[in-house]
Interface confidence: medium
């Protein structure tokens, strides 16, 4: 297993609809044909997998239909979008990139993107 640098933004604020997007960029040392991207969430020293997808270079990134993540890939950049976020989902979202094939296997883990989610205030009742 060889190390690889992964860069991602330090902070992202989710939209009022609970959607957060960020770019995960990796420094590919070789010509990989298969890349696996995993988003991990770290909160209160607990790390959980949010979503994962493997894609082929030159092809678009697809997560499974029931995933809360969507994404696109372009060269060594992956544009990730996480939906359905609520205030309780605030935390550090870490991008993990693996160059699966061909050998050698490379692994890179970003420093994480702190995603802040603020639940929208309920609309006040109106007589109008």
């Amino acid at each position: 297993c060889k190390a690889m640098h992964v860069a991602q933004p330090a902070v992202v604020l989710a939209s009022s609809r609970g959607i957060a997007s960020f770019v995960c960029e990796y420094a590919s040392p070789g010509k990989a044909t298969e890349v696996r991207v995993t988003v991990l969430r770290q909160a209160d020293s607990q790390v959980t997998e949010v979503c994962a997808a493997t894609y082929m270079m030159g092809n678009e990134l697809t997560f499974l239909d029931d995933s809360i993540c969507t994404g696109t890939s372009s060269g060594n950049q992956v544009n990730l979008t996480i939906q359905g976020l609520r205030a309780m989902d605030t935390g550090l979202y870490i991008c993990k990139v693996e160059l699966m094939y061909p050998p050698p296997y490379y692994l890179g883990i970003g420093n994480g993107t702190q995603i802040y989610v603020i639940d929208p205030e309920p609309c006040p009742d109106s007589d109008f």
Epitope: E34, A52, A53, T54, M56, N59, E60, T62, L64
Partner: nanobody
């Protein structure tokens, strides 16, 4: 775990056609990409074609316009239609399944292009 079983290989004359099939079983719900690789005698593995869960395809330059990859999600199958075959297409063809936690290979099927 995902299991893959290829079929359809054989001997064909230059300019001929073959259709390879790959049947997936097991945890197929976790597959979001399927592909065909090949290994020619004395050479390394080469990605031939791939298709994702939305049906988007990609091909290595040497087979563009001759090979077509397709996927039938209802039957858990992926196909490789190979037309205008050349001697340099002779290889063992392997099916590949990829997902968030899945990376499976088939056992391979031999394609020989010779007159």
């Amino acid at each position: 775990e995902v299991q893959l079983l290829e079929s359809g290989g054989g001997l064909v004359q230059p300019g001929g056609s073959l259709r390879l099939s790959c049947a997936a079983s097991g945890s197929i719900f976790s597959i979001n990409h399927m592909a065909w690789y090949r290994q020619a005698p004395g050479k390394g593995l080469e990605l031939v074609a791939g298709v994702n869960s939305r049906g988007t395809t990609n091909y290595v330059d040497s087979v563009k316009g001759r090979f077509t990859i397709s996927r039938d999600n209802s039957k858990n199958m992926v196909y490789l239609q190979m037309n205008s075959l050349r001697a340099e297409d002779t290889a063992v063809y392997y099916c590949r399944a990829l997902g968030g936690a899945v990376a499976a290979w088939g056992q391979g099927t031999l394609v020989t292009v010779s007159s």
